[in-house]
Structure formats: C-alpha cells, structure tokens
C-alpha cells in the first residue's frame, strides 16, 4: 500500500491530525522535499551571519558573513575574521607573516617561499609577507 | 488540553473590514508562536498571518499584506486578526493554529477549533 504522505510536495509536511493530509510549513519552516511528516526551522543569519539567500517554504536560508569576516564549513557554518594580506590569523589576532612565508590573501595561513634551488633555478624577484618569490632560469 | 474557539466571521462586502478572534485555552499566547491560516473552496489550507516569536517577527502572507494586521492580547488570552479592504478572494473559513515545535527540531502546528467562515460577496 502507498504512503499517503508520499504525495505531500515539498513545502508542506504530512498532517497526522487531519487524517495525513498535506499542510503548508509554518512561517520561518521549510520542507525541501516531499513526504515529510514535519517541517525543519530555517536558519536565522545573526550576528557576524548576514542572509544571502531568504529561508522559502522549500528551501533553508543561506547564509555568509559581513564585511571583515569570510565563511568557513560546510553551508558557511562559521565566520572567521579576515586579515590583511602579509599575515595569518592566530589565537591572539592576526600577526604578520615571518620571514621566508607569505600569505596573499585575507585567509588562511602563511606558506613558505618556494625553494627555487630545488629546481636549479634561481630567485629572479625576492619574496615578501605578501607574495611568493619568482624563480628564474 | 489545548483548545482555540474562533469568532467573529460573516458576510461582508468588498472593501468591507471585519476583526477576527480566537480565545485559548490550554496555553499561553503570548508564550507561544500563533496565527490564522485559512481554506479556501476548494483549495487547500495556506497560512495568512502569524506573531513568530522564535524568529522575532510577524509574517504575513503576500495577498494579506497592508491590508491585515494581527495582534494579540496577552490578559484575555486571545489573538486578533483585523482584515480590511476585504476581496472575494479573502472567502475562505479562517482557522487560529499554535505552531509546534517537535523535540527532534521539527515543526507542525495544531488548528483545534472550527474555524470562523469569511465570504466576501457583494
């Protein structure tokens, strides 16, 4: 026998107090897909979190972080602060890159300088907090 | 046991306003995400207006904005819907729902009453 709920699109949940007829999700609820017997809360972009994308009846909010934040984890779980090219962001701030590293963007950490003796050449332009030296023949 | 008793529905011309009522029971309006949602003829149930105080905010639908404002109040323990500029397309019987929010995180709502029958017809 078929699931009478199968037939509840998405944006409604299955109505167990009305005999599993299909009703629309609740404000600030969404259900992305068909034959579920509750809706899910949409997400709420709070804080450092600003919405992207508006929770609809069938799809969840997106979410991504204000200016001087970038996203990280999946679906932008978390916003990490930005810092300037030439550093890296520790526990205690952003702090800049030492030397023989480099960063050239507002994340992540800084990375050494590449060895260019390694591949028998040699340094045609210094390398900075900024930028990664270029190798020459 | 949760109850919710609807009033205040009737003819009305277009253009015509009307206030509707839903007395509690059971709960705490104030305390709880509430609102109206409403059937059409033949249609199926669409959600008209709510006080939503997880996310802070009051919702209205679309085809309900500027003309449909609600309120509640907190010492009778009842919630309002005042409709104004009233169109055909507002008949429909007009249900006051709880919102429900499940342990596992999910969300229904509970419509107890009979509702109260809107016609907008000249």
């Known amino acids: 026998l078929q699931d009478p709920c199968s037939n509840c699109p998405a944006g409604t949940f299955c109505d167990n107090n009305r005999n599993q007829i299909c009703s629309p999700c609740p404000p600030n609820s969404f259900s992305s897909a068909g034959g579920q017997r509750t809706c899910d809360i949409c997400r709420q972009c709070k804080g450092v979190f600003r919405t992207r994308k508006e929770c609809s009846s069938t799809s969840n909010a997106e979410c991504d972080c204000t200016p001087g934040f970038h996203c990280l984890g999946a679906g932008c779980s978390m916003c990490e602060q930005d810092c300037k090219q030439g550093q890296e962001l520790t526990k205690k701030g952003c702090k800049d890159c030492c030397f023989g590293t480099f960063n050239d963007q507002k994340r992540g950490i800084c990375r050494p300088w590449t060895n260019c003796s390694l591949d028998g050449k040699s340094v045609l332009v210094n390398g900075t907090k900024e930028r990664d030296v270029v190798c020459g023949p | 046991e949760v109850q919710l008793l609807e009033s205040g529905g009737g003819l009305v011309q277009p253009g015509g306003s009307l206030r509707l009522s839903c007395a509690a029971s059971?709960?705490?309006?104030?305390?709880?995400?509430v609102g109206w949602v409403r059937q059409a003829p033949g249609k199926g149930l669409e959600w008209v207006s709510a006080i939503l105080d997880f996310g802070g905010s009051t919702y209205y639908a679309e085809s309900v904005k500027g003309r449909f404002t609600i309120s509640r109040d907190n010492a009778k323990n009842t919630l309002y819907l005042q409709m104004s500029s009233l169109r055909a397309e507002d008949t429909a019987v007009y249900y006051c729902?709880?919102?429900?929010?499940?342990?596992?995180?999910?969300?229904?709502?509970?419509?107890r009453g009979q509702g109260t029958q809107v016609t907008v017809s000249s």
């Open positions: 729902a709880r919102v429900v929010y499940h342990a596992g995180g999910g969300v229904t709502f509970d419509t």
């Open positions: 059971g709960f705490t309006v104030s305390a709880e995400d």
